[in-house]
């Protein structure tokens, strides 16, 4: 995470800070998981493309009453330009596949780390 600095800061929160905090929160969730995350709730899998932040929020927002991911839900709203409501779906969802929230978080984290290795963040 020490490599994530140095971005331009066109918005109110520097993009590097927002991303660092999102990744740190995903790391916390995966590391601190004892009981099944969100009682084993299932969410729609998503295609991990450049629009994945909105898709991830659309998927996770359908999980209610799970305090462990509330911060992630709030943070993802800062990455999605559009208003996201429960029950809303874009074509980024692979709607024939549901996975556990724990696996969803793990996949998202791994993908973000992969993108950093590839230098895909401005």
């Amino acid at each position: 995470l020490t490599c994530l600095g140095g971005f331009a800061s066109p918005g109110p929160v520097p993009p590097s800070t927002a991303l660092r905090e999102l990744i740190e929160e995903l790391v916390n969730i995966t590391q601190n998981q004892k009981a099944p995350l969100c009682n084993g709730s299932m969410v729609w899998s998503i295609n991990l493309t450049a629009g994945m932040y909105c898709a991830a929020l659309e998927s996770l927002i359908n999980v209610s009453g799970c305090s462990a991911i509330e911060k992630t839900q709030r943070m993802l709203s800062g990455f999605c330009p559009h208003k996201v409501s429960a029950g809303q779906f874009s074509s980024l969802h692979v709607r024939d596949t549901k996975i556990e929230v724990a696996q969803f978080v793990k996949d998202l984290l791994l993908h973000l780390k992969k993108l950093f290795r590839e230098g895909q963040f401005n």
């Epitope: 971005f7 331009a8 066109p10 918005g11 109110p12 993009p15 927002a18 991303l19 295609n47 991990l48 493309t49 450049a50 629009g51 932040y53 909105c54 898709a55 659309e58 800062g78 990455f79 999605c80 330009p81 559009h82 208003k83 996201v84 874009s90 074509s91 980024l92 993108l115 590839e118 230098g119 895909q120 963040f121 401005n122």
Partner: antibody, heavy 115, light 104 residues
Framework: EVQLVESGGGVVQPGRSLRLSCAAS????????MHWVRQAPGKGLEWVAI????????YYADSVKGRFTISRDNSKNTLYLQMNSLRAEDTAVYYC???????????WGQGTLVT | EIVLTQSPATLSSSPGERATLSCRAS??????LAWYQQKPGQAPRLLIY???NRATGIPARFSGSGSGTDFTLTISSLEPEDFAVYYC???????????FGPGT
């Protein structure tokens, strides 16, 4: 039917200011991120700025950063672009563009010319 | 900053022929690439997003392929209304910066 109608373009001297407006209809404006994209005469497309559905985040192309400000009034279904310290190279048709979850530019206005 | 290069700059074709347009990114953009069509005096129109997904209302003769750095837009059999400028486009993952190719 989604409609985006730009206005406010015209001829302006270098160094002066201009404000463009975009009236949106046919969709729930307050739910969507919006962009400005421009096209210089005979040239290609250049993204200018994006604003979040609630105005909470704004991002700009390097070429306009510090000079242009994107804003919106959701009660009026209107998007704005305040352009200060205008330069000759800002001459272009300015398009107002709607985004969606996975498609940044899914509906475009017809554009307004700034010279 | 990712730079998109399109080739050829100009493609001369006739109705009924197959047209293949290329877009190359200076670094990997995964599968996030879109194609737009623009006719003189008109606003651009979305054709393809996420490299290969046709937008609503786009005829099946338009198809997109590729991933990483090399992408292709294919028009299987050109119709008279297909003669236009085509732009490829990508967005960075974060922050949201949007880039267009120079057009074909």
């Amino acid at each position: 039917e989604v409609q985006l109608v730009e206005s406010g373009g015209g001829v302006v001297q270098p160094g002066r200011s201009l404000r463009l407006s975009c009236a949106a209809s046919g969709f729930t404006f307050s739910n969507y991120g919006m962009h400005w994209v421009r096209q210089a005469p005979g040239k290609g497309l250049e993204w200018v700025a994006i604003i979040w559905y609630d105005g909470s985040n704004k991002y700009y192309a390097d070429s306009v950063k510090g000079r242009f400000t994107i804003s919106r009034d959701n009660s009026k279904n209107t998007l704005y672009l305040q352009m200060n310290s205008l330069r000759a190279e800002d001459t272009a048709v300015y398009y107002c563009v709607k985004g969606s979850g996975d498609i940044p530019f899914d509906y475009w206005g017809q554009g307004t010319l700034v010279t | 900053e990712i730079v998109l290069t399109q080739s050829p700059a100009t493609l001369s074709s006739s109705p009924g022929e197959r047209a293949t347009l290329s877009c190359r990114a200076s670094q990997s953009v995964s599968s996030y690439l879109a194609w737009y069509q623009q006719k003189p005096g008109q606003a651009p129109r979305l054709l393809i997003y996420d490299a290969s997904n046709r937008a609503t209302g786009i005829p099946a003769r338009f198809s997109g392929s590729g991933s990483g750095t090399d992408f292709t837009l294919t028009i299987s059999s050109l119709e008279p209304e297909d003669f236009a400028v085509y732009y490829c486009h990508q967005r960075s993952h974060w922050p949201p910066i949007f880039t267009f190719g120079p057009g074909t």
